[in-house]
């Protein structure tokens, strides 16, 4: 029978910048109960507070809901590990809630073959931001990337879109059966997980050159921009 | 409408006790952070107990450590202080007030009239 | 226990003049956790600044904070009615704590 090994916090993730959610990993045991708080301090502040909820991240976890999250604060956390023979201390983890956002998927992915009388075919792709984010406020720029791929093939085709709502794709295997996703990330902070595929079957008669490739912005009042692959590569962010 | 009512002050002799009550309204009371301050006579402002909105550790001023209690019921929007031991020195109008977020050292945006409790023999 | 002084003590002034109190810390201060209330006579407090120099929801902009370390003020740029009152500076780094008041008085 021992003192409990050291915990480690190692992760904490915000949804939205307005609440969020630290892990740990316990240490060893030591062979009896061992009980686990996390205290924290804002910087600055010469006072220690407990978690406030430590039930809405499931096991090992605190969650500081809206009340307790103040964006451009550090949070310095600490957990502590005691039963009967000790106790053990996780090292310090200092928490900016800016660079740890990791939204949730984009929404409402729409996948359309387009195929204008006067123009070449294309696969529009559309999609919703995540509904936690308020854009409007301008705390956040979203970035998006889409990736698909032809069903049966084992290479996904990234494409880094910027902060755009919806994107155009020429280069495609006509009769070919896509999955097309989205996902999304903030300025600072983490890619979101990706969205549910959407599955598009395209045509027999789709052909287009497969050097170039036909991005729309909605921004640009529904002017379009043709951009090479090159352009398209340099444009992608991992 | 925002507010706070404070009851339960009155006439107590030295040595006695007083349990004051605070009743929130028109907020989401269990977003914040929630104190009492009192202010003596003619006297400025004085923090005396406060805890942040889940009812977690309770913090106090060394003049009232182990005498005074605070409490809150989250359900009723209530807070409560439970004062033991007067002296004459606690006589004074106490506020219930809010912090703006959800910890108790806060800045204090929301105070109530203030509850009088005199401690005389 | 950090303990906040205020200065002047009181300030006679007239309506429409620029008020400035003072207000000094017994140690460093992060500017995240300084506020500044007015009281009026017969009234409760009432939040003008919090976090140094951020106003309250519904305080006029003749109301500025400002300040850093130990050292922190309140400027009022245009003195109203209203404000011939009791202002009171309050720390919350750690167990918070109200400075003694500084009174402003009409001249």
């Known amino acids: 029978q021992l003192p409990p090994g050291k915990p480690e916090i190692f992760k904490c993730r915000s949804p939205n910048k307005e609440t969020f959610t630290c892990w740990w990993r316990p240490g060893t045991d030591g062979g009896l109960p061992t009980n686990y708080s996390l205290t924290y301090h804002r910087e600055g502040e010469t006072l220690m507070h407990e978690c406030p909820d430590y039930i809405t991240g499931g096991p090992n976890s605190c969650h500081f809901g809206k009340q307790y999250t103040s964006m451009w604060r550090t949070y310095i956390m600490m957990v502590n590990a005691t039963n009967q023979m000790g106790s053990s201390f996780s090292d310090e983890l200092y928490v900016d809630v800016t660079y740890i956002v990791q939204p949730d998927p984009p929404l409402e992915l729409a996948v359309e073959v387009k195929q204008p009388e006067d123009r070449k075919p294309y696969l529009w792709i559309k999609w919703s931001p995540p509904t936690l984010i308020d854009l409007k406020t301008g705390w956040f720029t979203l970035l998006y990337e889409i990736r698909l791929k032809p069903e049966k093939a084992a290479e996904w085709e990234i494409h880094f879109a910027g902060q755009q709502t919806e994107f155009k794709i020429l280069s495609l295997h006509p009769g070919q059966k896509y999955l097309v996703q989205v996902r999304c990330k903030p300025d600072h902070g983490y890619w979101s997980a990706w969205s549910p595929a959407t599955f598009i079957q395209i045509p027999s008669d789709f052909t287009m050159n497969d050097e170039q490739k036909l991005i729309s912005e909605e921004d640009l009042g529904g002017e379009q921009k043709l951009i090479s692959e090159e352009d398209l590569h340099h444009h992608h962010h991992h | 409408e925002v507010q706070l009512v404070e009851s339960g002050g009155g006439v107590v002799r030295p040595g006695g006790s007083l349990r004051l009550s605070c009743v929130g309204s028109g907020f989401s009371f269990d977003d914040h952070g929630m104190n009492w301050v009192r202010q003596g006579p003619g006297k400025g402002l004085e923090w005396v107990s406060g805890?942040?909105?889940?009812?977690?550790?309770?913090n106090y001023a060394e003049s009232v450590k182990g005498r005074f209690t605070i409490s809150r019921d989250n359900a009723r929007n209530s807070l409560f202080l439970q004062m033991n031991s007067l002296r004459a020195e606690d006589t004074a109008l106490y506020y219930c007030?809010?912090?703006?977020?959800?910890?108790?050292?806060?800045?204090?945006?929301?105070w109530g009239p203030g509850t009088m409790v005199t401690v005389s023999s | 226990e950090i303990v906040l002084t205020q200065s002047p003590g009181t300030l006679s002034l007239s309506p429409g003049e620029r008020a400035t109190l003072s207000c000094r810390a017994s140690?460093?201060?992060?500017?995240?956790?300084l506020a500044w209330y007015r009281q009026k006579p017969g009234q409760t407090p009432r939040l003008l600044i919090y976090g140094t120099s951020s106003r309250a929801t519904g305080i006029p902009d003749r109301f500025s904070g400002s300040g850093s370390g130990t050292d922190f003020s309140l400027t009022i740029s245009r003195l109203e009615p209203e404000d011939f009152a009791v202002f009171y500076c309050q720390q919350y780094a750690g167990l918070p704590t109200f400075g003694p008041g500084t009174k402003v008085d009409i001249k």
């Open positions: 805890f942040n909105w889940n009812g977690g550790s309770t």
């Open positions: 007030v809010r912090g703006r977020s959800g910890w108790f050292n806060d800045a204090f945006d929301v």
């Open positions: 140690q460093t201060i992060n500017s995240n956790y």
